[in-house]
């Protein structure tokens, strides 16, 4: 549902993007996500703030939460207890990391219109979640998790050892937070609410990166983070569950590492409940090309989990690391013994496999030259997945359905032709037995989610169609998008260009790439947006291109795998590539050629600047890793191993974007990063801008004081309006 | 405005029985989760039972065993049979959906057990 062209009579009431259009987000896109509480029933939020619930089957809908209610505590969030009995309300929610946030807690008895009063929960809290069944309360607060039987009782104190920054009971650490649960919480609940399972993180030998934090004092503050960069001693993690009924009689219990694991460094990657006496625990070797699945067992008798090792399920890829970004997470059937998981198939794809005793004996689901990407549910008779099968796209899709109750089983693209040309890219969120589901699109068109019915798939009502965002849109000359691909030595680069409105393929016009380019990344999908290189196309006449290269996902292992222990090589070669293409289609204009990219688009950028092949005039980084020593473990040593001698250090020194200084003569640089990044540190582009002053090179700078790594608030104001500046100076276009 | 009119309360002894009705009006549809809650008398109005649209029943520990709830549909109707009553079940006993409508309490229906 993209505006279609209008009549030369019309255009001339049509306007271009503005920069500040894409500043104030003016043509950002709702989504509709059910907060599911039943086979049939979800809360929503509605425009005025009231909590309603909407039962589907009865077609009837209420308030159970008042505006002013959630307003008296001034709540930006909430949850409903699981018997329905008490909401929590959050409050004061202050960011820390990527996910991780506290806030002020307030539990509100529905029954009697009251909050509770009495054992009030302290502040601030770490995380907080109900029980699965009733309304037992787990939360965590300064690294000790707490429990309470009902939100009026006193706690009961679980862990006793948690201490900032050394300590992590419940909740993770910077690390495991960002690159491999990744999640604020670190707790699980069985599935009725018997037990808890939680992580301990030991950070005590970790080394910290220190920063200085300006605020408004008179000294600034230092924010000091237990933060392994590659090589580096790593958080030791152990994993505990405790008897939620009876929490004072044995205590916590420790779940007992797999051998093979235990040998030598290792990780856990993540818990999944399948029944209330069985867990599924899954490890990581540090050298990540092996992970194991390991099933336990609860013993009455010593009150212990057992996890027998013909209960134990190894992974293993020979070519590359384990898993996509992360692992797979197994999705279990019925019998709560067998599950499905995604991992490589023989010819190279990550496919849908049906595990019941061992690995080898697994049954593929699913297979072709296409990925499948996401489990979403299993059913008595059904199962839900997504894939980037159809018409061979592989940054679409949509969901399907295997029939798992039938023999042999047959399979339904459930999204295919639903809005052919509006719709190429969704997701789906399922109700309690996958009763119903929502489908949210997200393009290429506007997006737009709807309720189904989950026996018979058919639509049966719009929650959300943007009708707003399509209003606003009538008037203004979008530009026109095209996903295509280049052959080039065996190798597949898909790309996406945004033309601009009046493209004419005689004329010649400055090309910006825009790159990310990290291991298992896609940026050529087919969805929907209105940002800045919208607005350099509609308005400053740019041709934009991005280009899945060497390393990006969900085009098989052979193009995934490619840049294992080799990071900065393939990924810029094949931007370079992918020019040189474009510039042999006619219409772009050589000498005004830019690329730019953020975070690993930045390190990509900065090592394409400086390749010394004279096609860009112009870069920008934004946030760059400038050497893998600099970056966290989990992540850096998954693609390049270890920094030693006799693994890698070679190939880290020599990806390094400081090793290429005296390459930046010949082009403009405009490098920028947060003062306050807790993930890619500034000491990254301090030691660009150190390396390019020794050597002697001009280039621009910028920092944002106090900023993180998502450069937000008036930062990406004036981000986005010097980066502008700076691209129309370099490509001599009049402001 | 969602009427629910609760009604079948009455005086009885310790060990009798009693059941409550609540008749949903014409726009509500019983259908809906729904549940019983009493409040006793200088006491916070508490919940009781609840039926889920899909027929699933859960109750509070005080009375787990003693009171079932149940619904005719055809009638747009909820129940509670309250068996083996005991004095501290005496209250106002209201019924509502689960979770209850944002400010839509009934008259409610008062239950006496006397010993």
């Known amino acids: 549902l993209r505006p279609s062209r209008v009549h030369n009579s019309e255009e001339n009431t049509m306007r271009a993007l503005t920069l500040k259009d894409i500043l104030n987000g003016t043509f950002s896109y709702k989504t509709f996500f059910p907060n599911w509480i039943s086979g049939q029933e979800y809360l929503h939020q509605s425009a005025d703030n009231n909590i309603v619930l909407y039962n589907i089957e009865t077609g009837q809908s209420y308030t159970i939460l008042s505006n002013r209610t959630m307003k008296s505590v001034n709540a930006s969030n909430y949850g409903l207890s699981p018997d329905r009995q008490f909401v929590y309300l959050e409050s004061d929610y202050s960011k820390l990391w990527r996910y991780s946030y506290t806030a002020t807690y307030y539990i509100y008895d529905l029954s009697n219109g009251e909050f509770v009063r009495g054992n009030e929960l302290p502040r601030p809290i770490q995380y907080l979640c109900w029980s699965p069944v009733g309304s037992k309360l787990a939360y965590v607060y300064q690294n000790n998790i707490y429990l309470k039987q009902r939100p009026g009782d006193p706690p009961f104190q679980i862990t006793f050892n948690g201490r900032e920054n050394k300590i992590f009971n419940g909740i993770p650490d910077w690390v495991y937070e960002e690159e491999m649960l990744p999640t604020k919480y670190a707790l699980w609940w069985s599935p009725n609410g018997k037990f808890l399972a939680y992580a301990e993180f030991n950070d005590k030998d970790i080394p910290v990166i220190a920063y200085s934090y300006y605020g408004d004092e008179q000294y600034p503050r230092t924010i000091n983070i237990p933060y392994p960069k590659a090589g580096a001693k790593n958080p030791v993690v152990r994993i505990f569950i405790i008897d939620t009924t009876y929490p004072a009689y044995v205590g916590p219990q420790e779940v007992p590492v797999p051998a093979m694991i235990a040998s030598s460094d290792y990780y856990f990657s993540w818990l999944t409940w399948v029944t209330d006496e069985r867990v599924c625990l899954q490890w990581l070797k540090r050298v990540q090309n092996v992970s194991v699945l390991s099933i336990c067992d609860f013993r009455e008798d010593w009150q212990t989990w057992d996890c027998p090792k013909t209960q134990e399920h190894i992974e293993e890829s020979r070519t590359g690391w384990a898993g996509g970004f992360f692992v797979s997470r197994p999705v279990f059937s019925y019998d709560a013994i067998s599950y499905y998981k995604i991992f490589s198939d023989k010819d190279g794809y990550k496919h849908i496999h049906y595990i019941k005793d061992t690995v080898e004996n697994a049954i593929q689901i699913t297979s072709g030259k296409w990925e499948a990407i996401n489990i979403f549910r299993v059913t008595q008779d059904s199962l839900f997945y997504s894939s980037n099968e159809f018409e061979e796209y592989p940054g679409r899709r949509n969901i399907y359905r295997i029939s798992i109750g039938s023999y042999p089983p047959s399979k339904k693209c459930v999204t295919c032709h639903l809005r052919k040309e509006r719709c190429q890219y969704y997701t789906a969120s399922f109700s309690d037995y996958a009763k119903y589901y929502a489908l949210v699109c997200y393009g290429p068109g506007i997006p737009i989610s709807t309720l189904h019915d989950g026996r018979t798939d058919q639509e049966i009502k719009i929650l959300e169609e943007n009708k707003e965002l399509e209003n606003a849109l009538k008037n203004i000359q979008l530009p026109k998008e095209e996903i295509k691909k280049l052959e080039v030595d065996e190798i597949t680069l898909w790309y996406k260009m945004i033309l601009p409105p009046q493209f004419d393929r005689s004329k010649k016009y400055p090309l910006l790439i825009q790159v990310y380019g990290g291991p298992c990344s896609q940026s050529v999908r087919s969805v929907f947006a209105v940002n800045w290189i919208s607005y350099l196309a509609s308005k400053e006449g740019m041709v934009i291109a991005l280009v899945d290269g060497r390393g990006t996902a969900f085009q098989g292992d052979k193009l995934l795998y490619a840049v294992y222990r080799k990071l900065g090589v393939y990924e810029v070669e094949d931007q370079i590539t992918a020019v040189r293409k474009f510039i042999e289609m006619g219409f772009i204009d050589e000498k005004r050629i830019a690329i730019w990219g953020w975070s690993y688009g930045g390190y990509v950028s900065s090592l394409a600047l400086a390749s010394g092949t004279g096609l860009f005039k112009c870069g920008i980084a934004v946030a760059p890793v400038s050497s893998w020593e600099y970056y966290a473990s989990v992540y850096t040593e998954r693609f390049m191993g270890l920094p030693t001698k006799d693994d890698n250090l070679e190939h880290y020194k020599n990806s390094t974007v400081m090793a290429r200084a005296e390459y930046f003569r010949n082009v403009d640089y405009l490098l920028i990063h947060g003062t306050a990044d807790d993930n890619v540190h500034f000491q990254n582009s301090a030691q660009i801008a150190k390396a390019l002053v020794n050597a002697q090179v001009d280039f621009q700078a910028m920092w944002y004081s106090d900023q993180n790594h998502g450069l937000s608030g008036l930062s990406t104001n004036h981000l986005y309006t010097h980066m502008t500046h700076f691209l129309k100076q370099c490509f001599s276009l009049s402001d | 405005q969602v009427q629910l009119q609760e009604s079948g309360g009455g005086l009885v002894r310790a060990g009798g029985s009693l059941r409550l009705s609540c008749a949903a009006s014409g726009t509500f549809d019983s259908r809906n989760a729904m549940g019983w809650y009493r409040q006793a008398p200088g006491k916070r109005r508490e919940w009781v039972a609840t039926?889920?649209?899909?027929?699933?029943?859960n109750y509070a520990d005080s009375v787990k065993a003693r009171f079932t709830i149940s619904r005719d549909n055809a009638k747009n109707t909820v129940y509670l049979q309250m068996n083996s009553l005991k004095p501290e079940d005496t209250a106002v006993y209201y019924c509502n959906a689960a979770p209850p409508i944002f400010g839509s309490w009934g008259q409610g229906t008062q239950v006496t057990v006397s010993s």
């Open positions: 039926i889920t649209t899909d027929g699933r029943t």
